[in-house]
Each structure stands twice: as C-alpha cells, then as structure tokens.
C-alpha cells in the first residue's frame, strides 16, 4: 500500500505528462510492491517556502507497511529526489521526505484493513 504524497509550489502546468505513472513504476520497483497497490498524490500550486525562499521546493511523505528503514529510506530519498529534480526541476536540497512505517491494522482498504 505505499502512498507517496508530494506537496509543491511548482505549478501544475510544470508537471510533465506521465509523471504519475513514472512515480508509480519507480516506487513499485524500489519497494518491491505491485504497481496496483501504489498510490501517488502530487499537489502542485501550493503556497510554500523552504529556507525562507519560494523557489521550487517539495514537502513529501512516503507511507508503507514495512519496507521502511534507514538504508531503504536513503535509497528512496535518492530515487525520489532524483525524480523531483529531473521532472519538476526541484533541487534535492529543497526537498523533505517523511517516512512512515504503517501498522497493517491502521491502513484501511476495500472495506477492511491490511491486517
């Protein structure tokens, strides 16, 4: 159930075609989870500042049941910062990503939970 959320001040017209499926594919590969369980949410046009500057920036979160941890998170950061830099032109030093290891019982889906 990996869920990746990107809040950014980049305008929606700067989000390139195919960005959502690209995120989905890359996250599926990185987490080892099937693409059909990956959810991505890109929220553009936000009023944001990072370090006092309104240059392009992003505040992100990655929720997953397992597959979260020190080494894995470093790998995700490299992947996701790379995509945000390449596709949205956001410098990696203007990106925060919070990682959440979810308890299966606390994630609802399809009338139930993953527990």
């Amino acid at each position: 159930m990996p869920m990746f959320i990107v809040n950014t001040n980049v305008p929606r017209a700067s989000v390139p075609d195919g960005f959502l499926s690209e995120l989905t594919q890359q996250l599926a590969q990185a987490t080892g989870k099937p693409p059909q369980y990956i959810a991505v949410h890109v929220v553009p046009d936000q009023l944001m500042a990072f370090g006092g500057s309104s240059e392009p920036c992003a505040l992100c979160s990655l929720h997953s049941i397992g597959k979260i941890g020190g080494a894995q998170n470093r790998s995700y950061s490299k992947l996701l910062c790379g995509l945000l830099a390449e596709r949205l032109r956001i410098s990696p030093d203007r990106v925060y990503i919070n990682y959440y290891d979810m308890n299966a019982a606390n994630v609802g889906w399809n009338n139930s939970t993953f527990a």
Partner: antibody, heavy 123, light 107 residues
Framework: EVQLQQSGPELVKPGASVRISCKTS????????MHWMKQSHEKSLEWIGG????????SDNQKFRGKATLTVDKSSNTAYMELRSLTSADSAVYYC????????????????WGQGTLVTVSA | DIQMTQSPASLSVSVGETVTITCRAS??????LAWYQQKQGKSPQLLVY???NLADGVPSRFSGSGSGTQYSLNIYSLQPEDFGSYYC?????????FGGGTKLEIK
Amino acid sequence: EVQLQQSGPELVKPGASVRISCKTSGYTITEYTMHWMKQSHEKSLEWIGGITPNTGVLSDNQKFRGKATLTVDKSSNTAYMELRSLTSADSAVYYCARRGNNYYGSSPWFAYWGQGTLVTVSA
Amino acid sequence: DIQMTQSPASLSVSVGETVTITCRASENIYSNLAWYQQKQGKSPQLLVYAATNLADGVPSRFSGSGSGTQYSLNIYSLQPEDFGSYYCQHFWGTPYTFGGGTKLEIK
C-alpha cells in the same frame, strides 16, 4: 478551439537538417506538454518525445536521441522539432500532439493532433 | 521497451457488422492504453483512453475493454465512416509505443 498548425512539406537532401514547427492556438503553449510522433510505412507510428514548455523538461524515446531536438518558443506559442543528419529512413509524416484538457501529470492520451508535416529525404 | 502486438493487420467487413481489434502488450500496462482512428491522409483521432473510456464525441458503438496485457476495441454495427486504420498505444512508461495498426476495409 484548440488547434495545432504545422509547417508545410519539406524536401531535403541526405545529411541535411530540417526544422518543423507546430503553432498552437486556443490555449497557451506553456500549459501542456507537447509531443511529437513519426509515421512511416515501415514502422507505423512512433513516439519521438515530449517537452514540457514551462521547464524545458524532456521525455524522449532513446531511439531518436541525436536525431530529434525539441524546443519551444513561448512568445510565439510555437513548438519546434529539428531533425538532423537526415537519411531516407527519416522520410515520414511528423505530427505534434497534445493530451486532453485535464489529468495533469497523468498519461498523455493524445486528444489534439497537428495536421502532419511530410518530410521527404532525397538526393 | 514494451512491445504492442496488434491484430489483425487488416480485415474486410460489411456495413452493419461488428468487429473486434486486439492489442497485446509485452508486459502488464495497467490499462494505460489508448485507441486511435486514422483516415487516409488525416491525423489520428483519439477514440478510447485508459482502455475503456470513450473520448469526447465518439459514438457509443465504439467500446474499449481489457486489462493486464490484453486489450480490445469493439465496433458494433459498423458505419461507412468507420473504415480506416486503427492503432493502439500504451502509456505505461516511455517510450510510448504504438501497435502496428489494423486497416479496416469495406467488403
């Protein structure tokens, strides 16, 4: 009404370059990624690549790297594709295309197409 | 790259008949598929997107179906204006490849 108006047919010599234009109307070019396609008898339709005008971000088909260069002139609402080192294999109809009016960031179903530009490479 | 295998390459049918054109992807494309119609000397026109959704202005006799690697375009009660070429195209990662096309001719 969204329209993509392409430049006219080109007859060019092998080894030369050609630049095809795609002038947009009915919307501002910076709002949407612009894509280019090649259609030849041998290879059906092929996606060459797309350019997001706001940022200049390119998404391309590795097969056409070194062959096609995509650019945008925001002031004139025009997208360009330059093809270089032309050979007979580059003889084809080239199209610019754009997705529909919603689904930012999603798969670019091509709802709007230019009328096509015929490029003929011949000595 | 994902390969799109379209069949048949051509078919000859009569007005009023129903036809099915199929497209097979070399891997799961998760319904990221479009169908286009192209008349001789004209640009392609979007018929179906996301495998099953009809584009604006497309008659209801057209219908897209499928999932995973197998997709179909059905045309019910063929009309004279339906003759031409049809192409599928996937959007599950670049390059976005097209099928080889199906030429629909009047019998």
